[in-house]
Structure formats: C-alpha cells, structure tokens
Interface confidence: medium
Amino acid sequence: TLNSVLNSNAIKNLPPPLGGAAGHPGSAVSAAPGILYPGGNKYQTIDNYQPYPCAEDEECGTDEYCASPTRGGDAGVQICLACRKRRKRCMRHAMCCPGNYCKNGICVSSDQNHFRGEIEETITESFGNDHSTLDGYSRRTTLSSKMYHTKGQEGSVCLRSSDCASGLCCARHFWSKICKPVLKEGQVCTKHRRKGSHGLEIFQRCYCGEGLSCRIQKDHHQASNSSRLHTCQRH
C-alpha cells in the first residue's frame, strides 16, 4: 500500500525576520507545541528532537552524513548523523566534517591550497555524485561559493534559502533541495500538530509570506482531522 505524501513548512534556514540569523534555528514566535522549527539539521519541535531519515549523504546537512545509527544495524533505516571530526575513523569523505577528508580510514585536515584548483574545476560537474571521491567531498565544502554567484530561480538546486532569489526559499523536493516560492495568501501550507508526525518529508513547502501565518482553513473546522487543510492567512 502506498504511504501518504508528507509535506513540511520546516525549512532549514529561515531568513530574518521569520527565522533567527540565517543558518540558525527559527525563533519560536507564537508557537504551539509540536510546531517544527529548523534546529541544526534535524527537525526540532519545541520539546522534541527527531532524527532526519535519509537515503544518501546529499540529503543531510553539511555537518552530517547518512548512515545506520547502529553498527551493523538495519541498512534500510538510515538517518543523518553528525560528521566526524579530525582523527576520527571514516569510510568515505562525507563522514568527515567540512575542512577534512577521509584518508586511510581516518578524517584528516585538507590542505586547502592543494585542493582548491582541482575543486574549482570539478565542482559543477560533481554536484550530486556519491561521496566516494574527492569530488563528492569537495561539493560539501565549496558548493555555495562556486555555484551561487547569481541567486537561484524557481526550480534551481540550492543549499539554503539565501541561495535563492527574492520571494523564494530553499526547500526539499524529491530529496534534493530546490528554490520554491514563498507561500502567498490562500495557498496551502503545512502545520504539524503531533510530535513525530512529519515522517519522511520529500515535499517541503516554504513558509508563509510576510504578514501571513499558517492556520486551519475556516470552512474546514468541522472536517475530520486527516483532511484538515491549512492555508496562509492574514494575522
């Protein structure tokens, strides 16, 4: 049986004033319990952290990699794990924190001068490949500086909302992240009501635009819980 598509307004980097400083958790203004805010690279409820499910390293943040949480655990259950610092054991570049790479099973510091020329030439072609090569590693550390001299248009691949043009945010879509429109009045938004209800979210939505908040549609108050529709409405 096909599971339901799950959506989210929880974008990793909310731009001010909707969030905190870029790259930091959004402020919990007029928050209800269980509403999701970006916290690091996990979906953070006000009183709860949830591991982020993944299938590839690309699905995780720059300080994370995708792996089974338990050694020798079920390969089908993978989450984003914190990257490994210098001198820690590794199996591929993605496991090592930015500024490091995996050499002979150990995370070692990268000589930026040594790598930079090669990275600059290969970054555009390499983006999205497995993290089993230097190219995969290089994508993590220099992607934003290489690819985003111009702001991304709708549908462009992005890492964070600041990579996108005005009126767009960076949101997950099919496990990639692309620039999507910030929601307008009347458009469907997603508000999570229960802890852990977000599941595997491949269709994130942007947040509601300025002066709007995500609230239950007036004519849907009587509807069953499962079909309640939230839309962006004036405060």
Partner: antibody, heavy 116, light 111 residues
Framework: QVQLVESGGGLVQPGGSLRLSCAAS????????MSWVRQAPGKGLEWVSG????????HYADSVKGRFTISRDNSKNTLYLQMNSLRAEDTAVYYC?????????WGQGTLVTVSS | DIALTQPASVSGSPGQSITISCTGT?????????VSWYQQHPGKAPKLMIH???NRPSGVSNRFSGSKSGNTASLTISGLQAEDEADYYC???????????FGGGTKLTVL
C-alpha cells in the same frame, strides 16, 4: 535550454528485452532525480520508475518491479531503463522526465511495442 | 492504494472558464496535499502546468490556476483559447517507497 532525448524503443517479442536511453543536456544532470513515465496507446500516463541523483536510490511501480531496472551514468548525462521479460501490456511511449519542480521537463518519448 | 478520479471530458467555448476536478480516495487524504497538473497535446510530451496545488511554473499563463478543497483538487482555465484543447492529468506522489499516481486524464474540448 533543458533537453531530454529518449532512444532505444522498437518492436520486441513478449519475454524479450530492451534498453532505453535518455540523453540529458542544458542542466546539471547529476543534481536531479529522474523518472521514467509511460503512456499506452490511447491511454493515460503511468509512472514507471525514479532514481536519485547518484543512482543509489531507485523506486519502481508495482507493475514493473523485478522486471525493469533504472540506472544512470552521470559522466555521460544519460538515464537508462533496462526492460526484461516484456509483456504486451508494456507497449507504450516511454518518456524520461526530470524531477525538478515535480516532473518539470519531459522528453518527446520513444515507442516500445511488445508483440509476437 | 492511491486513486485519483477525473472526469473523462469537459468542454467550453472560447473566453469561458472551465474547471477540471481531481478527486482522491479517502485513504490518500494526507498524501493528497501535493498535487500537480499536466497538459498534453496529441502526439506531444506532457507539460507541467501547476505544482503543489496552486503554483504555476514560470512560462505558464496566469489563465491557469489550481486549488484544493478537502479531497478534491481543481484546475481552472479562464479565458479559454483554442490552444487549450488538450488532455489534462492530475498527479500526486506517495513515499516509502516513492511512487507517483496520475489521474485518468480529462479531454478538454474548446467548442
């Protein structure tokens, strides 16, 4: 200009095999998930398969599971669909599509006819 | 399983507005949030017209709009033109595993 060009279609007998290719250009191929969608003559659209940007994550419609294999070669900017144990009901135009903002770009399709 | 139901055909005169509905089964209410619409002219590839229920990709005329209420998504075409005559498909996605479902399609005839 985003372009997707399918090839490899043709006439094949039931039980036979065929490999479709989709050459992509005009965008960074390795940054996008890709899909195959088919359309039987005079019928509607049916999603067949999807593949992640690196190829390590693949998904199939129940109707083709175990018979079709989706793959990609990012160095060649090419998407593939290996079709084995073909049946008459697999007869269709096969489209490759980019999974950007949904299925935002499609090729013109290649016709696969399964008949004895 | 997810099922999307569309009317087989609709028609309208030039300048009129028409609406095509797409109804999801109750089992996919949660998954029916993300709905897209595609236009397909005979012998041509489908074209994305609306994504996430109401968003138009760049280049798509603002005569096309989408909405959703309860279990039904709708595509409205205002100021109908001859070139709008085509088949229209709604579509949604399911996850774990990833899968996509299309409606049966609606043939739009411009009288």
């Amino acid at each position: 200009q985003v372009q997707l060009v399918e090839s490899g279609g043709g006439l094949v007998q039931p039980g036979g095999s065929l490999r479709l290719s989709c050459a992509a250009s005009g965008f960074t191929f390795s940054s996008y998930w890709m899909s195959w969608v088919r359309q039987a003559p005079g019928k509607g659209l049916e999603w067949v398969s999807g593949i992640s940007y690196s190829g390590s994550n693949t998904h199939y419609a129940d109707s083709v599971k175990g018979r079709f294999t989706i793959s990609r070669d990012n160095s060649k900017n090419t998407l593939y669909l290996q079709m084995n144990s073909l049946r008459a009901e697999d007869t269709a135009v096969y489209y490759c599509a980019r999974m950007g903002i949904d299925l935002d770009y499609w090729g013109q399709g290649t016709l696969v006819t399964v008949s004895s | 399983d997810i099922a999307l139901t569309q009317p087989a055909s609709v028609s309208g005169s030039p300048g009129q507005s028409i609406t095509i509905s797409c109804t999801g089964t109750s089992s996919d209410v949660g998954g029916f949030n993300y709905v897209s619409w595609y236009q397909q002219h005979p012998g041509k590839a489908p074209k994305l017209m609306i994504h996430d229920g109401s968003n138009r990709p760049s280049g798509v005329s603002n005569r096309f709009s989408g909405s959703k209420s309860g279990n039904t998504a709708s595509l409205t075409i205002s100021g109908l033109q001859a070139e709008d005559e085509a088949d229209y498909y709604c579509q949604t996605w399911a996850t774990s595993p990833l899968s996509s479902v299309f409606g049966g399609g609606t043939k739009l005839t411009v009288l």
